[in-house]
């Protein structure tokens, strides 16, 4: 026996004293353990385990399945094992035909031997079909035969173990080897919505998608800042081999305004870990935001167009959208549509175009939206910039001459002195009196300015132009002065357009 | 050619030492456990001892008649075994047998011719 | 120790007979039992291991039978190099002993 120290414990001895014995099908397994200390026999083989706490295991008569390693143990925890092959002609192999395979790992296909003492122990394809080239093994008659680094393309390879007995090869039940995948990426994860816009008391369901090649991916739904475990519901799928596919639902039936916050769906694997965030707000009631994309006070000149423009934000989704003016609701030339086609768009545009503005269209015209929840309405004061227009040029009975004048901005009246037939009036002439007739009436369209002066400063025979101007342009009347004795005659008055 | 052969044997005062070897060719030595095995002139044989392989660690046996006195070794890499024979008696004359153990069962498949150790003053 | 048993210590018999002999463990060695036959000056041969399986070489005309205590070796038709004195043995438990042998010589 090897060398042991008095007083230390050794392992149990085993008679026969062998390592490996062959016995014959139908013999008894007779073995005996020596040890003061004796405690158990233990049987293994596959994932079979027997014990017997006899310090002789007697198996009457032998059978295939009695092949396997038998061990003694004693009180101190030490062993000794034999391994006990039964030679059965008829039955060469024990087999567990489940055979599972981790990428790019070693997996064992069960089929230890009855007879270790047969030849050429492999494995062959089935059908007479060859293995892939690559597939490398090594054979163990006691646990069968490793693949060594098992490929995905070996993925449902139909395979026997085999040995030759007597000269004649002879095939194990068939073993269909089911590869693992390994990971070798993150999972790829995506959300239903990557918002949400939620009623207090409105169902919040959001779906988290997650695609790995096995479901041995592990997801959850977390809410950030928050250890609460969140209700979730799956719905998988395999779509192939390696295409496996998730569907993680989080539902919370009766949304309340503190559930507001961001989700975040996480998933990880092996390789690492990936995540996807929604957020979900939740308002006590609907909303509508309107934003001018313009000033709300527009000035255009006479003639041009003009677009009213808004964006606004409406939750729920907008029922009821109008363009009114003096009252009067605008059936063409208004579109409203949303700012994106996204599926949780709440931003909603809406343009009004105005064309060829006339003078007298300058006024409010309002916006006015609604949903379920509420109204809302936004106003655009127009002002139209007309050129002055002389409406009246006179000489009163007493003397005064008289120019009234109407147009947007307020018009400035000039007026000017031409001696004789001379046709640039140079010398200014101050009014004796400027009036704004129209400043207290409707607040938008044209605007007349009354300016009068006394004719009876003029000596001589000339002309006396009133020149009226805004921003937009200009428009002048001429007073035509002759002198006959002592009386002054108003000739022809005309007015002259200067761009 | 599987066989063994056995020397070293020879005559030998009672109380001195013998050694014997017994080397091994045509198969693998060391997947084998070794014994020796002795026939007295004229009598039956005799089991002396064993000693197991690497998978047995090497454990030895051997019979009440031998043990303390004799030591059995082996060499796996000269594909010898040895017995180591010390303080001999007359009663130790015998022809010493070196014998094979097949792999998977306690018989002696394969044996030496034989060495005679002759111990007499 | 087991003891052997072996009986007859010898037997006459002639070519062509059948040949009969036993052997007595003093414990059951359920098959742990092996059967030898030995010429003078020469090693002995392995016949018959586990109590019945033949070593590879040896002719059908050798068998072994019993287990547990009790066991035979037959030789079914002797021939005239069966002449040889026959050595059971147990390999149950070291020490593992031999019968003190059967001689079998020619009547």
């Known amino acids: 026996q090897p060398s042991v120290s008095p007083g230390e414990p050794s392992p149990p001895s085993i008679h026969p004293a062998k390592s490996e014995l062959i016995v014959r099908v139908g013999n008894e397994i007779r073995l005996l353990c020596i040890d003061p200390g004796f405690v158990k026999w233990t049987f293994e083989i596959l994932d079979e385990t027997n014990e017997n706490k006899q310090n002789e295991w007697i198996t009457e008569k032998a059978e295939a399945t009695n092949t396997g390693k038998y061990t003694c143990t004693n009180k101190h925890g030490l062993s000794s094992s034999i391994y006990v092959f039964v030679r059965d002609p008829a039955k060469l192999f024990l087999v567990d035909r489940s055979l599972y395979g981790k990428e790019d790992n070693d997996t064992l296909v069960r089929c230890p031997l009855t007879d270790p003492e047969v030849t050429s122990y492999s494995l062959k394809g089935c059908q007479g079909k060859p293995l892939p080239k690559d597939l490398r093994f090594v054979p163990d008659p006691k646990a069968g035969i490793t693949i060594k680094s098992v490929k995905r393309a070996y993925h449902r390879l139909c395979l026997h173990c085999s040995a030759d007995q007597e000269g004649k090869s002879v095939l194990s039940d068939k073993f269909i080897l089911k590869v693992r995948p390994a990971f070798k990426a993150v999972p790829v994860v995506s959300v239903s919505k990557a918002s949400y816009l939620l009623r207090e008391g409105e169902e919040f369901t959001v779906t988290c998608t997650i695609k790995d090649v096995s479901s041995s991916v592990y997801s959850t739904w977390k809410r950030e800042n928050s250890q609460t475990k969140l209700q979730e519901k799956y719905n998988s799928w395999h779509h192939g081999d390696f295409n496996y596919e998730r569907q993680a639902t989080l539902t919370i039936s009766s949304a309340r305004v503190n559930d507001s916050g961001v989700f975040m769906c996480y998933a990880n694997n092996t390789f690492g870990s990936a995540n996807v965030t929604t957020t979900l707000e939740v308002v006590d009631k609907g909303f509508i935001n309107i934003f001018p994309m313009i000033n709300t006070t527009v000035f255009v000149n006479d003639g041009e167009n003009v677009d009213l423009i808004v964006e606004y934000e409406a939750f729920p989704k907008p029922e009821h959208q109008q363009w009114i003016y003096m009252n009067r609701t605008f059936t063409d030339k208004w579109e409203d549509y949303p700012k994106s086609e996204n599926e949780s768009n709440i931003r909603y545009v809406s343009e009004l175009h105005l064309t060829r503005l006339k003078g007298t269209e300058g006024g409010t015209y309002t916006f006015l939206v609604s949903n379920s929840d509420v109204n809302a309405s936004i106003a655009f004061n127009v002002y139209v910039n007309t050129k002055p227009e002389i409406l009246t040029y006179d000489r009163l009975v007493n003397g005064m001459l008289q120019c009234v004048a109407a147009g947007f901005p307020e018009p400035t009246i000039d007026w000017y002195f031409c001696p004789g037939t001379e046709q640039r009036c140079s010398a200014s002439v101050l009014p004796v009196d400027v009036q704004t007739l129209n400043a207290s009436g409707p607040p938008f369209g044209k605007l007349v300015v009354q300016s009068s002066i006394d004719s009876s400063a003029f000596k001589h025979n000339g002309t006396v132009e009133c020149k009226a101007y805004n921003d937009v342009g200009k428009t002048s009347a001429y007073f035509n002065f002759a002198f006959k004795g002592n009386n002054k005659e108003q000739i022809h008055p005309h007015t002259l357009f200067t761009p | 050619e599987v066989q063994l052969v056995e020397s070293g044997g020879g005559l030998v005062q009672p109380g001195r030492s013998l050694r014997l070897s017994c080397t091994a060719s045509?198969?693998?030595?060391?997947?084998?456990?070794m014994n020796w095995v002795r026939q007295a002139p004229g009598k039956g044989l005799e089991w002396v001892g064993r000693t197991r392989n690497a998978a047995g660690s090497y454990t030895t046996e051997y019979a009440a008649s031998v043990k303390g006195r004799f030591t059995i070794s082996r060499d796996d890499s000269k594909n010898s075994l040895y017995l180591q024979m010390n303080s001999l008696k007359t009663e130790d004359t015998a022809v010493y047998y070196c014998?094979?153990?097949?792999?998977?069962?306690?018989?002696?498949?394969?044996w030496g011719r034989g060495t005679l150790v002759t111990v007499s003053s | 120790d087991i003891q052997m048993t072996q009986s007859p210590s010898s037997l006459s018999a002639s070519v062509g007979d059948r040949v009969t002999i036993t052997c007595r463990a003093s414990?059951?060695?359920?098959?742990?039992l092996n059967w030898y036959q030995q010429k003078p000056g020469k090693a002995p041969k392995l016949l018959i291991y586990?109590?019945?399986s033949l070593q590879s070489g040896v002719p059908s005309r050798f068998s072994g039978s019993g287990s547990g205590t009790d066991f035979t070796l037959t030789i079914s038709s002797l021939q005239p190099e069966d002449f040889a004195t026959y050595y059971c043995?147990?390999?149950?438990?070291?020490?593992?002993?031999f019968g003190g042998g059967t001689k079998v010589e020619i009547k």
């Open positions: 586990a109590a019945s």
């Open positions: 043995q147990q390999s149950y438990i070291a020490p593992y002993t």
């Open positions: 045509g198969f693998t030595f060391s997947d084998h456990d």
């Open positions: 414990q059951s060695i359920s098959s742990y």
């Open positions: 014998a094979r153990e097949p792999k998977y069962w306690i018989d002696f498949d394969l």
